[in-house]
């Protein structure tokens, strides 16, 4: 007998994120542990600190398979917060722990990111 | 359905030139700035530059100013990277990408990628 497609159980794993330009950053992660689940969106938010505080994320899809997304326009001296789901037809999983990342300005601009 | 194919990848000695296209479909590819960037074999992704829809002007990241050129033709919906004097550490995939705004919402799309080999 067949079983009926599942959304995804658990986050998506390993989130790291990297700057990689003095506004922009590269988030990649792992498909969901677990049973073969089918993933056909993943939703990346973030926000810098103070805009998470006040509710206020912006919400990235990314299409597909791909594990990789850039962020863009990032402001020098924010920390951003930044965590991910994946989704398919049937529904959205969990999202991961929340990863930060510091943008410093530029003379300083060795990224620092740890998970929270 | 938003796509983006990149072409014109292959092998090329060092010093050599080559141009990549991406060609868009799918969405209003003259609204929306576009991004190129590439990844060498067990390396972390590189940001190239990106491209205004609006001026036209490109913006490169570290490193890419000088050898690399970023154009679009908004009235064929193609995105080009002309890339001139290539060496070796230039080998990767090559991608293009744009992020599309859906009301408060962004949708990013990567196309498939193509592969440059810079080789003797």
């Known amino acids: 007998h067949s079983t009926l497609p599942e959304a995804p159980a658990g986050p998506p794993v390993g989130v790291k994120v990297t700057l990689i330009e003095d506004d922009t950053a590269l988030v990649s992660w792992k498909p969901p542990d677990g049973p073969e689940t089918v993933v056909t969106r993943y939703t990346i938010l973030y926000a810098s600190r103070k805009a998470w505080i006040a509710g206020e994320w912006q919400v990235l899809h990314r299409e597909g398979a791909i594990t990789m997304a850039l962020l863009e326009n990032l402001v020098a001296g924010n920390v951003y917060i930044v965590k991910i789901s994946a989704s398919n037809e049937v529904g959205e999983g969990p999202f991961s722990n929340s990863v930060e990342l510091a943008v410093l300005p530029k003379e300083t601009s060795e990224s620092n990111q740890r998970p929270k | 359905e938003v796509q983006l194919v990149e072409s014109g990848g292959g092998l090329v000695q060092p010093g050599g030139s080559l141009r990549l296209s991406c060609a868009a479909s799918?969405?209003?590819?003259?609204?929306?700035?576009m991004s190129w960037v590439r990844q060498a074999p067990g390396q972390r992704l590189e940001w190239i530059g990106w491209?205004?829809?609006?001026?036209?002007?490109?913006r490169y990241g570290q490193g890419f100013t000088g050898r690399f050129t970023i154009s679009r033709d908004n009235s064929k919906n193609t995105l080009y990277l002309q890339m001139n004097s290539l060496r070796a550490e230039d080998t990767a995939t090559y991608y293009c990408?744009?992020?599309?705004?859906?009301?408060?919402?962004?949708?990013?799309?990567w196309g498939q990628g193509t592969l440059v080999t810079v080789s003797s």
């Open positions: 491209i205004d829809t609006k001026t036209g002007n490109p």
């Open positions: 990408v744009s992020t599309v705004p859906n009301g408060v919402e962004y949708f990013q799309h």
């Open positions: 799918g969405f209003t590819f003259s609204n929306y700035g």
